[in-house]
Structures are given as structure tokens and as C-alpha cells.
Interface confidence: low
């Protein structure tokens, strides 16, 4: 809920539909990157406000007679990460009336993403010739996951996943070995996670 103790009056949902809020180049970036938050209204608006939910005033205003407002966050720091929402309003709505807030956009500013876990499904000990599934699980959605095998320089498999995990299938004959994984943002500027702890797959 973005309605704080002062100054924001949000009308019922039927009044003015919520805008869309997105981030360029990404919602996960390293410190020092310039981030643009774009708030797009479903109709031309007069003023846009960018909020961190729960704060009593907007972080930024933009007065633009169009459907799109851009908020520039220069050389972001980890402290600027967190939840953001935007609203818009038109002068004919009367002061104090804003649209419904956009869905929350989570901005993460970090040097390194949290270490993922790597587990074998159903377990790390498999029957000879049986396929095995490895799950690399991070904490963020829409990431690219990479599986490594010890002794092999190149990544073994890639997966892009909308979920905070990715599953890799190992064919039975080649399954035994030592594996690790990591994940990263799907586009530049890339933010990488730490590597997972290693997982040893062996035959019964």
C-alpha cells in the first residue's frame, strides 16, 4: 500500500487505471549503472510521481503532457534498490487525486547475486544409465542459469528461466561427475551470482 500518512489520496480502482513501470537497462544492475525507470500511463497524463511504497512523499516528479514519463537514477547505489511504484494524474481530476499505483518494480543494485543451490532430483546417487535432473535454484526470476562440470572449461548447459530456478537433464551414461552452477542477468550490464557449492553425482 503506498498510501502514507500525508499527501497521497488514491481513488478506488475503477477511477483511473494503473500505469506500467519498467526499468532500463534492467531491474538488476551493478552499482554505478545509470537506470531509467519508465512509467507508462494508459492515457495522456500531466504529472507522474515515483514512489517507494510507505514513504510520505514521492521520490521524483515528472510533469509531461504524454503517456510516458522517465525517471533517471544516475550511478545507482545499493541503497537505491528496493520497491518502486508510480502513479499519474491529470489537472482535471483535482488536486489530491492520483491513479491507482503501478505494480511494484523491484530494483536490485548489487555487485554479486546471492549464491544458488544445486541439487539432484531425485538424489545424487543414481542407477547406472539412469538420467538425472539437476536443479540450480537462485532467488530471482527471469535469470539465465549456467551449469558447469569440473574439468570442462566451457559451460555444460544454459537455461533461461522465468522461475527462480532452472532444471538441467544429464544423460545417464555421462551423469557421474562434479557439478556447479551460477546464474546471471539475461542482458547487459551483466550481474553474476557466486557459484553454487559443488554437487557430486555418482552411480550406485
Amino acid at each position: 500500500d503506498i498510501t502514507p500518512s500525508v499527501a497521497i489520496i488514491v481513488p478506488p480502482a475503477s477511477y483511473h487505471p494503473k500505469p506500467w513501470l519498467g526499468a532500463q537497462p534492467a531491474t538488476v544492475v551493478t552499482p554505478g549503472v545509470n537506470v531509467t525507470l519508465r512509467c507508462r500511463a494508459p492515457q495522456p497524463a500531466w504529472r507522474f510521481g515515483l514512489f517507494k511504497p510507505g514513504e510520505i512523499a514521492p521520490l521524483l516528479f515528472r510533469d509531461v503532457s504524454s503517456e510516458l514519463a522517465e525517471f533517471f537514477l544516475e550511478e545507482v547505489t545499493p541503497a537505491q534498490g528496493g520497491s518502486y511504484r508510480c502513479c499519474y494524474r491529470r489537472p482535471d481530476w483535482g488536486p489530491g487525486v492520483w491513479s491507482q499505483p503501478s505494480d511494484v518494480l523491484e530494483l536490485l543494485v548489487t555487485e554479486e547475486l546471492p549464491r544458488p543451490s544445486l541439487v539432484a532430483l531425485p538424489g545424487p546417487v543414481v542407477g547406472p544409465g539412469a538420467n538425472v535432473s539437476l536443479r540450480c535454484a537462485g532467488r530471482l526470476r527471469n535469470m539465465s542459469f549456467v551449469l558447469y562440470r569440473e574439468g570442462v572449461a566451457a559451460p555444460l548447459q544454459y537455461r533461461h528461466s522465468a522461475q527462480p530456478w532452472a532444471d538441467f537433464t544429464l544423460l545417464g551414461a555421462r551423469a557421474p561427475g562434479t557439478y556447479s552452477c551460477y546464474y546471471h542477468t539475461p542482458s547487459a550490464p551483466y550481474v553474476l551470482s557466486q557459484r553454487s557449492e559443488v554437487l557430486v553425482i555418482s552411480w550406485e
Epitope: 500525508v6 504529472r47 512523499a57 516528479f61 515528472r62 510533469d63 494524474r89 488536486p95 489530491g96 487525486v97
Partner: antibody
Framework: EVQLLESGGGLVQPGGSLRLSCAAS????????WTWVRQAPGKGLEWVSG???????NYAQNFQGRFTISRDNSKNTLYLQMNSLRAEDTAVYYC????????????WGQGTLVTVSS | QSVLTQPPSASGTPGQRVTISCSGS????????VSWYQQLPGTAPKLLIY???NRPSGVPNRFSGSKSGTSASLAISGLRSEDEADYYC?????????FGGGTKLTVL
């Protein structure tokens, strides 16, 4: 601490000019609508002019052409240039910050007295 | 002559409930929000109510605001001697901010 401090008031002759300043501290000056409100001795509050975050300033009809509002975001300061002053402009002039909706004034300065007299 | 009309004076005894009215038109109060300010003698106005009925933090819940049609009202319950002040309503009309003429509240 959030503070507004007006200055520049004083005694001026009819037809003269005066420039009022309002120095703000404690929040991001550039993010807000700023306004001047005046109060003649023993009278009520009267809105004078406002400076939006972007776009043209707006004025109450009585002041259009004689008064000019401006702001310097780098100095966190709001100004009111008053020309062709009349005796009826004698008042305490308050600078105030609008709540972000622009619909109300949530922080006020202590006011500066302008006296127009010969 | 103010566009928003308030009674010039109101009074009450300690502990009483007092209501101050503010009358406008469809172009201001009727279509916009109303705020209320308290001005103690010799001081700057202070925001009491915004958006018709919302209290900023720090304002006691003895103060309440409401709006109906083209009129608004400020109610003060449990009246105290320190409530003796001038009270102003404020709204918005076609890019201008409008104030009522003010009501002087006397605590008897």
C-alpha cells in the same frame, strides 16, 4: 529538520520594488510545488503565486504582470519579485511548500512583513 | 470578498464540540479537495486537514474534516483553550488556490 526561512521584507514606497526570498532546507526542493501566500494586517490568507516542478508559474489574477515568482533549485530557494507596489500590498508574505498533490500546503515559513507606505 | 465562505466567528466552552463551515461552488469545493489550516495568534498557518478528511501526523484526532457537495466542515471535539485561533478552509479552482475568509474561534 524541515525549514523555510523568508527574507527580503521591509518598508518600500508606493511604486517601488522588492524581492522576497525563501530558503528551504530538510528536503528535496526541486521535487515540489512552491507557493507564496500573503496576509494583510487583520485580514485572511490570500494565495499569490505558485511555481510548479516543471512548466509555467501561475498567479492569482490580482498579481499577474506585477509579481514574478522564480526558483533556484541549486540554491533551494524560492523568490518573489514584486514591482509597482501599492499600499494594499502591505502584508505578511508566507512561502509554503505544497503537499505533492498540489492540493494543500503542508509546510509554511514564518513570514516576512512588507510595508508599502510613503 | 472570498470565494469560499466561512462564518467570521465561532465559540464554545472547553470540552464542547464546535463545527466550522465552508461553502463554495461546483467549480471549487464541489470538484476538488478541501484543506483546513489553524493560525494561532502571531504565527504562520498550520495544516490541520487535507484531502477533505485526512489529518497530517501530529494533528490530534479531536480535529476532523468532512465534505458534502459544495460545502465542507471542520469539527473540533473536546475543545481546549489552546484551540483558540483563526481557522481557514482552502480549495482549488481553475489553477488558483482559494482560501475562505477565516473563522475566529473563541474558547469561552
Amino acid at each position: 529538520e524541515v525549514q523555510l526561512l523568508e527574507s527580503g521584507g521591509g518598508l518600500v514606497q508606493p511604486g517601488g520594488s522588492l524581492r522576497l526570498s525563501c530558503a528551504a532546507s530538510g528536503f528535496t526542493f526541486s521535487d515540489y510545488y512552491w507557493t507564496w501566500v500573503r496576509q494583510a494586517p487583520g485580514k485572511g490568507l490570500e494565495w499569490v503565486s505558485g511555481s510548479p516542478v516543471f512548466g509555467a508559474a501561475n498567479y492569482a489574477q490580482n498579481f499577474q504582470g506585477r509579481f514574478t515568482i522564480s526558483r533556484d533549485n541549486s540554491k533551494n530557494t524560492l523568490y518573489l519579485q514584486m514591482n509597482s507596489l501599492r499600499a494594499e500590498d502591505t502584508a505578511v508574505y508566507y512561502c509554503a511548500k505544497a503537499g505533492f498533490t498540489g492540493g494543500h500546503f503542508d509546510i509554511w515559513g514564518q513570514g516576512t512583513l512588507v510595508t508599502v507606505s510613503s | 470578498q472570498s470565494v469560499l465562505t466561512q462564518p467570521p466567528s465561532a465559540s464554545g466552552t472547553p470540552g464542547q464540540r464546535v463545527t466550522i463551515s465552508c461553502s463554495g461552488s461546483s467549480s471549487n469545493i464541489g470538484n476538488n479537495y478541501v484543506s483546513w489550516y489553524q493560525q494561532l495568534p502571531g504565527t504562520a498557518p498550520k495544516l490541520l486537514i487535507y484531502g477533505n478528511s485526512n489529518r497530517p501526523s501530529g494533528v490530534p484526532n479531536r480535529f476532523s474534516g468532512s465534505k458534502s457537495g459544495t460545502s465542507a466542515s471542520l469539527a473540533i471535539s473536546g475543545l481546549r483553550s489552546e484551540d483558540e485561533a483563526d481557522y481557514y478552509c482552502q480549495s482549488y479552482d481553475s489553477s488558483s488556490w482559494l482560501f475562505g475568509g477565516g473563522t475566529k474561534l473563541t474558547v469561552l
